[in-house]
Interface confidence: low
């Protein structure tokens, strides 16, 4: 088992290293509907938490330039061209941007208003808008660059419930599983292992940039020939899992402690826990608010 | 020098519904840096603390009054204002408005307080 | 919601004296703790924020410590202008309950 001890935690790095973009980059073409992903889980049903999407950067406090803004039973302000496709009385609040030009790039902020202060979860996505090309755009609307499905799991609630984003439909995506024990440490760090708040949060990585995914080819062969002669088959190249790794691997990685400038997870210390058979979960402390969504999901306390 | 001034009828009668205003002055009311709140005071008692809302209108209100209470802004003028429905002799009260706000993550708690003012409830 | 309790409710003292204050939250808070001071007749005014962080303007024989649930504040050399009641406050959660007061007086 120990011997699996340096490439896992490599691998691991690697994983980190690719996801630590400043912003993830969601594109549309001129004319078509832009898509930016937003989730949280109500802690019951109908028990929503208000949400805003403004353009620009989140602020300190709300959003800047309101576009669309849902409170604890509907959708209250919207205005035109801006809507929310999927159900956010489930917790999709997912924006779609009808009909996009050329000035709707730019920065969206998409504002989980959880109850508490600075519990609020801030996530900065940037809508890059590309010119309408000559020949026919395909008949899809979503033309965006990371599609993230998502997975979610409070503490003691048992196995986690998995919902997938068919946008990339034949791309396998990788599957790290997190628990979150802080959301941020701003300089009055709140503790929401104290007030029992403690949320695991369920990261997909999407394989969708350019240079991602051929990063991800070369690393696919890499664990092809690593693995080839082990039991599990990778079938797909574009393929990292970690969900057959031994959980030393994680150990040994969470010994370092990873950190990203823009995206900084701490990895703790002795923390890993076997949730079900051949899938390792690790423990992950989010020091500060991560800048891109990273397709999560908030399973709220 | 941000100042804080509440108004609105002092006696109330029960059932009725409390509305008292609070006017901001000498401050950014529309900044995204404050939220704003009302606190109430029963005589010779402590401090209960009603609700707040932040600039662009989200609201959170006490879980105990929160099926009658209402807080709304009213940008135009720097007022935000408070409504308590179905009141009863228990609402008697001094009522602060106040003002909170955030130094980059640090959260400022109310530094800026109205003088108050007492609402009876009465028949 | 979260409770906050005070201790003790009524604190004689006499000019000089150094006084503490205790402040016990119902569930962790962090540092999300504030102190306020309210005369007879008077708004709150804000003493301490983050538990520990003087308010511009208040003299520094006020101090605040603590983190987690229990809390205190600290008046070095009492002075007559400090008898009053002190108030804690959380905002670690909504709603943002304060403690039921600490009333300190001319023994």
């Known amino acids: 088992m120990f011997s699996h001890l340096p490439f896992d935690c490599v691998l691991l790095l690697l994983l980190l290293l690719l996801t630590r973009s400043s912003e993830v980059e969601y594109r549309a073409e001129v004319g078509q509907n832009a898509y930016l992903p937003c989730f949280y889980t109500p802690a019951a049903p109908g028990n929503l938490v208000p949400v805003c999407w403004g353009k620009g950067a989140c602020p300190v406090f709300e959003c800047g330039n309101v576009v669309l803004r849902t409170d604890e039973r509907d959708v209250n302000y919207w205005t035109s061209r801006y809507w929310l496709n999927g159900d956010f009385r489930k917790g999709d609040v997912s924006l779609t941007i009808e009909n996009v030009t050329l000035a709707d790039s730019g920065i969206y902020c998409c504002r989980i208003q959880i109850p508490g202060i600075m519990n609020d979860e801030k996530f900065n996505l940037k809508l890059v808008i590309k010119p309408a090309k000559v020949t026919p755009a395909p008949t899809r609307q979503r033309d965006f660059t990371a599609a993230f499905p998502r997975m979610l799991t409070t503490r003691g609630h048992g196995p986690a419930e998995t919902q997938t984003l068919g946008s990339l439909p034949d791309i396998n995506l990788t599957q790290i599983s997190t628990l979150a024990n802080e959301l941020r440490d701003s300089r009055l760090a709140n503790d929401l292992r104290d007030s029992g708040a403690t949320i695991r949060i369920g990261i997909y990585i999407g394989a969708g940039i350019c240079a991602g995914l051929a990063l991800a080819l070369i690393f696919g062969a890499l664990i092809f020939k690593w693995y080839s002669h082990s039991k599990e088959k990778i079938q797909n190249l574009s393929l990292i899992s970690l969900a057959n790794l031994p959980p030393s691997g994680l150990a040994n990685a969470v010994a370092e402690g990873i950190r990203s400038e823009e995206n900084i997870y701490t990895i703790e210390e002795n923390v890993y826990e076997v949730e079900e058979p051949n899938e390792y979960y690790c423990y992950v402390s989010s020091r500060q608010q991560p800048s891109q969504p990273l397709g999560c999901r908030f399973a709220m306390p | 020098q941000v100042q804080l001034q509440e108004s609105g009828p002092g006696l109330v009668k029960p059932s009725e519904t409390l509305s008292l205003t609070c006017t901001v002055s000498?401050?950014?009311?529309?900044?995204?840096?404050?939220?704003w709140g009302w606190i109430r005071q029963p005589p010779g008692k402590g401090l209960e603390w009603i609700g707040i809302?932040?600039?662009?209108?989200?609201?959170y209100y006490n879980p105990s009054l929160k099926s009658r209470v209402t807080i709304s802004a009213h940008t135009s003028k720097s007022q935000f204002s408070l409504k308590l429905s179905s009141v009863t002799a228990a609402d008697t009260a001094v009522y602060y408005c106040?003002?909170?706000?955030?130094?980059?993550?640090?959260?400022?708690?109310?530094?800026?307080w109205g003088q108050g003012t007492l609402v009876t409830v009465s028949s | 919601e979260i409770v906050m309790t005070q201790s003790p409710s009524f604190l004689s003292a006499s000019v000089g004296d150094r006084v503490t204050i205790t402040c016990r939250a119902s569930?962790?808070?962090?540092?999300?703790l504030a102190w306020y001071q309210q005369k007879p007749g008077k708004a709150p005014k804000l003493l301490i924020y983050?538990?520990?962080t003087l308010e511009s303007g208040v003299p520094s024989r006020f101090s605040g410590s603590g983190s987690g649930t229990e809390f205190t504040l600290t008046i070095s050399s009492l002075q007559p202008e400090d008898f009053a009641t002190y108030y804690c406050?959380?905002?670690?959660?909504?709603?943002?309950?304060f403690g039921p007061g600490t009333k300190v007086d001319i023994k």
């Open positions: 106040a003002r909170g706000g955030e130094y980059f993550d640090r959260l400022l708690p109310f530094d800026y």
């Open positions: 406050q959380q905002l670690n959660s909504y709603p943002f309950t």
């Open positions: 000498g401050g950014s009311f529309s900044s995204s840096s404050y939220y």
């Open positions: 569930q962790g808070i962090s540092s999300y």
């Open positions: 983050a538990a520990s």
């Open positions: 809302f932040y600039y662009s209108g989200t609201t």
